[in-house]
C-alpha cells in the first residue's frame, strides 16, 4: 500500500523512540567513523523533518524515498572525503546506486578502538546523569562495530542493557549484579551479529533463492506441524524483512518484523504449539522469542518421503511444472522430519535431489534413473555425523583452550596466508563449538554444530573478502554457501606456502601479559602459536605442544618473579632459542 510520505508512515508505525533509535543505527552502520555527537545531530534533524511530514504529508520533500532522505543527510557530513576517502564518491550518484555504494563500503572490521568497559560506578553515574544519551551511545558503539547487526534485535539488546543498569545501579553490590549481565549481553550480541552477517552474506552473495531455501529448511524444522503453504508465506515475509535490514532499510525492516510477529501470533494454532509464551510478551521480546523458539513436536504418522519424491511416476511432471515449488516441498518435507540434521545438510540433500532430477528427467527411463536417489544421501549425512563425533571426542579429551589450539594449528596449516588476528579469532570461535554443542544429545548435535560452524566460517569469509590473500579461502567461500564447511574440512596442508621469515620480535613478551585477563592471555599465547606454525608449517603436534608448554611455564614463572620485566627479557631470549632448536628453525 502506497503512502504519500514514507517517512511519516514509518514514524507513525514505529513511534518516535524506535524511529530515532533505528535512524541512529542506520547512520552509524553506514558512517562507522563519525563521532557520536555528529550522528545524534543528524538523527535529530531527520526526526524533526519526519514530524513535519506527520503533521502534513504533502509538505516539501515528504514524498521522497527514505534512501533519498537518509542519503542526502549522510552526504551533508563535512569531513566525508577526509574520513572515508572514496566512499565520498557515493554522494555523486543517484538513488538507488548511491545506497548500493554506501552498502559496498560497510566495513566488517573497522579500525576502531576496542571497547573498554569503565568502572561500574562510572557507568552507573553516566547512566543516571543522562539515560537517553547513555543508551544512544550503546546503540551507536555496537552499530558502528557491527554494520550488519539486525537492527530490530539491537533495540531488544538496548532494552535489556537499560534494564540491567536500572536494576543493578540500585543494588548493594553493583558489580556482582551488573558485570555478569553485561558479559552475557556482549557474548549474545557477538553471536547475534555473526548470525545476521551470515543471513546478509547469503542474500547478497548467493541471492534470494539461497536465503529462501535456508528459511524453508529452518522454519520447517521449527514448525513441522505447519502446512507447506503456511511455511512458504512465513519464508516470503521473513525474506522481505532480512532483505530490508541487510539493505540498510531499517525502518521498513523493523516495521515488517513487527507485522510478521503479529501474524505468527494471530495464527499460532496453524503454526506451532510452542509459541504461546512468546506471544504473551511485548513486541521486542516477542519477536526475539519467536526467532529463538524451540522446534515443535513432529506430527505423528508422517508418511514415507519416498512415495511422493522417488516412487511416484509423477515426479518429473511435478518437477517440470514448478521446479522451485516442488523442490521447496521436498525440502519442507525432509526438514520437518529431520530436526536432527543441520540446515546446511538439508540444503545439500535438496541440491543433490535437484541435480538428480535435472539429469534423470531428461533420461530415457526417468524412474529407473532417479530410483536410487535417496542412497546418494547416505554419505552426505554420515560425513558431518562422523566429523562431529571425532571433534567432540577431541574436545572432551582436550578441553576448550587446547581444542582451540588444535584448530588453530589445523587452520593455519590449511590457509597460512590469512592474517594472524583473523586465524586466532576464527579458530577460537570454531573451538567454542565444543562447549556449545558437544554437551547435547546426538539428535541435537549436528544442527547445533554444523550451523554454528557456518556462522563462524562466514566470519572468515567476510574478513578475507576485505583483504583477499588466499585463493583456497576465496574458493571455499564463493563456490557454494552450503558446502563451505566441507570445503574447509577437506583442505589439507598448503604445500605451496613459503614459511614466514623468523622474527624474534613476534616472540618477545613483556610484563604487561601478567595483568591481562585469562582470555587475553590465551589470545597472546594463541597468537604466538599461529606465528610458530607460519614459521614452521611442517612442525609436528608434539613439537608444537612442547614449545607451547615451555611458553606457558615461562609466562607463569616470569609473572611470579619480583623483577618481571627482566625475567621476560632474559628468559624470553632463552625460550626463543630453545624453541628454534626444538623446531629446527
Amino acid at each position: 500500500d502506497a503512502h504519500k510520505s514514507e517517512v511519516a508512515h514509518r514514524f507513525k508505525d514505529l513511534g518516535e523512540e524506535n524511529f530515532k533509535a533505528l535512524v541512529l543505527i542506520a547512520f552509524a552502520q553506514y558512517l562507522q567513523q563519525c563521532p557520536f555527537e555528529d550522528h545524534v545531530k543528524l538523527v535529530n534533524e531527520v526526526t524533526e523533518f519526519a514530524k513535519t511530514c506527520v503533521a502534513d504529508e504533502s509538505a516539501e520533500n515528504c514524498d521522497k524515498s527514505l534512501h533519498t532522505l537518509f542519503g542526502d543527510k549522510l552526504c551533508t557530513v563535512a569531513t566525508l572525503r577526509e574520513t572515508y576517502g572514496e566512499m565520498a564518491d557515493c554522494c555523486a550518484k543517484q538513488e538507488p546506486e548511491r545506497n548500493e555504494c554506501f552498502l559496498q563500503h560497510k566495513d566488517d572490521n573497522p579500525n576502531l578502538p576496542r571497547l573498554v568497559r569503565p568502572e561500574v560506578d562510572v557507568m552507573c553515574t553516566a547512566f543516571h546523569d543522562n539515560e537517553e544519551t547513555f543508551l544512544k551511545k550503546y546503540l551507536y558503539e555496537i552499530a558502528r562495530r557491527h554494520p550488519y547487526f539486525y537492527a530490530p534485535e539491537l533495540l531488544f539488546f538496548a532494552k535489556r542493557y537499560k534494564a540491567a543498569f536500572t536494576e543493578c545501579c540500585q543494588a548493594a553490590d553493583k558489580a556482582a549484579c551488573l558485570l555478569p549481565k553485561l558479559d552475557e549481553l556482549r557474548d549474545e550480541g557477538k553471536a547475534s551479529s555473526a548470525k545476521q552477517r551470515l543471513k546478509c552474506a547469503s542474500l547478497q552473495k548467493f541471492g534470494e533463492r539461497a536465503f529462501k531455501a535456508w528459511a524453508v529448511a529452518r522454519l520447517s524444522q521449527r514448525f513441522p506441524k505447519a502446512e507447506f503453504a503456511e511455511v512458504s508465506k512465513l519464508v516470503t515475509d521473513l525474506t522481505k524483512v532480512h532483505t530490508e535490514c541487510c539493505h540498510g532499510d531499517l525502518l521498513e525492516c523493523a516495521d515488517d518484523r513487527a507485522d510478521l510477529a503479529k501474524y505468527i501470533c494471530e495464527n499460532q494454532d496453524s503454526i506451532s504449539s510452542k509459541l504461546k509464551e512468546c506471544c504473551e510478551k511485548p513486541l521486542l521480546e516477542k519477536s526475539h522469542c519467536i526467532a529463538e523458539v524451540e522446534n515443535d513436536e513432529m506430527p505423528a504418522d508422517l508418511p514415507s518421503l519416498a512415495a511422493d519424491f522417488v516412487e511416484s511416476k509423477d515426479v518429473c511432471k511435478n518437477y517440470a511444472e514448478a521446479k522451485d515449488v516442488f523442490l521447496g516441498m521436498f525440502l519442507y518435507e525432509y526438514a520437518r522430519r529431520h530436526p536432527d540434521y543441520s540446515v546446511v545438510l538439508l540444503l545439500r540433500l535438496a541440491k543433490t535431489y535437484e541435480t538428480t532430477l535435472e539429469k534423470c528427467c531428461a533420461a530415457a527411463d526417468p524412474h529407473e534413473c532417479y530410483a536410487k536417489v535417496f542412497d546418494e544421501f547416505k554419505p552426505l549425512v554420515e560425513e558431518p555425523q562422523n566429523l562431529i563425533k571425532q571433534n567432540c571426542e577431541l574436545f572432551e579429551q582436550l578441553g576448550e583452550y587446547k581444542f582451540q589450539n588444535a584448530l588453530l594449528v589445523r587452520y593455519t596449516k590449511k590457509v597460512p596466508q590469512v592474517s594472524t588476528p583473523t586465524l586466532v579469532e576464527v579458530s577460537r570461535n570454531l573451538g567454542k563449538v565444543g562447549s556449545k554443542c558437544c554437551k547435547h544429545p546426538e539428535a541435537k548435535r549436528m544442527p547445533c554444530a554444523e550451523d554454528y560452524l557456518s556462522v563462524v566460517l562466514n566470519q572468515l569469509c567476510v574478513l578475507h573478502e576485505k583483504t583477499p590473500v588466499s585463493d583456497r579461502v576465496t574458493k571455499c567461500c564463493t563456490e557454494s554457501l552450503v558446502n563451505r564447511r566441507p570445503c574447509f574440512s577437506a583442505l589439507e596442508v598448503d604445500e605451496t606456502y613459503v614459511p614466514k621469515e623468523f622474527n624474534a620480535e613476534t616472540f618477545t613478551f613483556h610484563a604487561d601479559i601478567c595483568t591481562l585477563s585469562e582470555k587475553e592471555r590465551q589470545i597472546k599465547k594463541q597468537t604466538a602459536l599461529v606465528e610458530l606454525v607460519k614459521h614452521k608449517p611442517k612442525a609436528t603436534k608434539e613439537q608444537l605442544k612442547a614449545v607451547m608448554d615451555d611458553f606457558a611455564a615461562f609466562v607463569e614463572k616470569c609473572c611470579k618473579a619480583d623483577d618481571k620485566e627482566t625475567c621476560f627479557a632474559e628468559e624470553g631470549k632463552k625460550l626463543v632459542a630453545a624453541s628454534q632448536a626444538a623446531l629446527g628453525l
Epitope: D301, P303, S304, A307, D308, V310, K313, D314, M329
Partner: antibody, heavy 121, light 110 residues
Framework: EVQLVESGGGRVQPGGSLRLSCAAS????????MGWVRQAPGKCLEYIGI???????YYASWAKGRFTISRDNSKNTVYLQMNSLRAEDTATYFC???????????????WGQGTQVTVSS | IQMTQSPSSLSASVGDRVTITCQSS????????LSWYQQKPGQPPKLLIY???DLASGVPSRFSGSGSGTDFTLTISSLQPEDFATYYC???????????FGCGTKLTVL
C-alpha cells in the same frame, strides 16, 4: 475393522456446491494415496482424481477446476469439494485406497460403500 | 485416454472358462499398470488383479490376468455362481491424472 465411510452426499441444485468426506478407520490414511471415483446410475466407473500421501493432487481433465481433493491426516479423513455442480454430476461417489502412496496406479484395493449425490432443480 | 472392454456383455454357464479383454489407446505405465475389478449391484467395486497379472489378496486363483502395453486379458478358468457380475479394467498411465476405467463387461448366467 478396516473400512472407509463416505458422507456428505445429498440433493443439490445446479450451480451449487457439496463437500464429501471419507473417514478411514482401522488404518492410517497417511500411508496411501486416496482417490475418488464416481458411477452414474447404470453407467461406467469414472475416475475423478487422487491425493498422494504428501498432499500432491491429480485430477482427471474433466474434473480439474471444479473438484478439489484434500486430506486431514489428524482426522484420518479425505475430502472432495465439488463446485458448480451440474445434472450430469449425479452419481454415487466412492472414495478408495490406492496400492501406491505417491501416485495413482489405478489399483484401488479398499473402497467405501459410496454416497449418493443428486443434482437437480 | 480410452479403455475399451470387450465384449460389453457376456453370458456363460457355471464351470465355463471366460475371457474378457481390455485395450487402451496408449501404453499403460511400465507396460503393466492395469487392474481388474468385479462389481455386484449395490456394492463398490472389488480389486481382483493389479499390475496386469498379480492376484489381489483373498481373490480365488481361478482369476488370472495377462497382457502388456495396450492389450490385456482377464480369465476366469472355471466360473462359479458368485462370479456373475460386471467386470471393469482400469489403467494407470504416465500421469496420475490420466488413470481411466473401462466401461465394463456384464457377465450373466446363460
Amino acid at each position: 475393522e478396516v473400512q472407509l465411510v463416505e458422507s456428505g452426499g445429498g440433493r443439490v441444485q445446479p450451480g451449487g456446491s457439496l463437500r464429501l468426506s471419507c473417514a478411514a478407520s482401522g488404518f492410517s490414511l497417511s500411508s496411501n494415496a486416496m482417490g475418488w471415483v464416481r458411477q452414474a446410475p447404470g453407467k461406467c466407473l469414472e475416475y475423478i482424481g487422487i491425493i498422494s500421501v504428501g498432499g500432491f493432487t491429480y485430477y482427471a481433465s474433466w474434473a480439474k477446476g471444479r473438484f478439489t481433493i484434500s486430506r486431514d491426516n489428524s482426522k484420518n479423513t479425505v475430502y472432495l469439494q465439488m463446485n458448480s455442480l451440474r445434472a450430469e454430476d449425479t452419481a454415487t461417489y466412492f472414495c478408495a485406497r490406492d496400492r501406491h502412496g505417491g501416485d495413482s496406479s489405478g489399483a484401488f484395493y479398499l473402497w467405501g460403500q459410496g454416497t449418493q449425490v443428486t443434482v437437480s432443480s | 485416454i480410452q479403455m475399451t472392454q470387450s465384449p460389453s456383455s457376456l453370458s456363460a454357464s457355471v464351470g465355463d472358462r471366460v475371457t474378457i479383454t481390455c485395450q487402451s489407446s496408449e501404453s499403460v505405465y511400465s507396460n503393466n499398470q492395469l487392474s481388474w475389478y468385479q462389481q455386484k449391484p449395490g456394492q463398490p467395486p472389488k480389486l481382483l488383479i493389479y499390475d496386469a497379472s498379480d492376484l489381489a489378496s483373498g481373490v480365488p486363483s481361478r482369476f488370472s490376468g495377462s497382457g502388456s502395453g495396450t492389450d490385456f486379458t482377464l480369465t476366469i478358468s472355471s466360473l462359479q455362481p458368485e462370479d456373475f457380475a460386471t467386470y471393469y479394467c482400469a489403467g494407470g498411465f504416465s500421469s496420475s491424472s490420466d488413470t481411466a476405467f473401462g466401461c465394463g463387461t456384464k457377465l450373466t448366467v446363460l
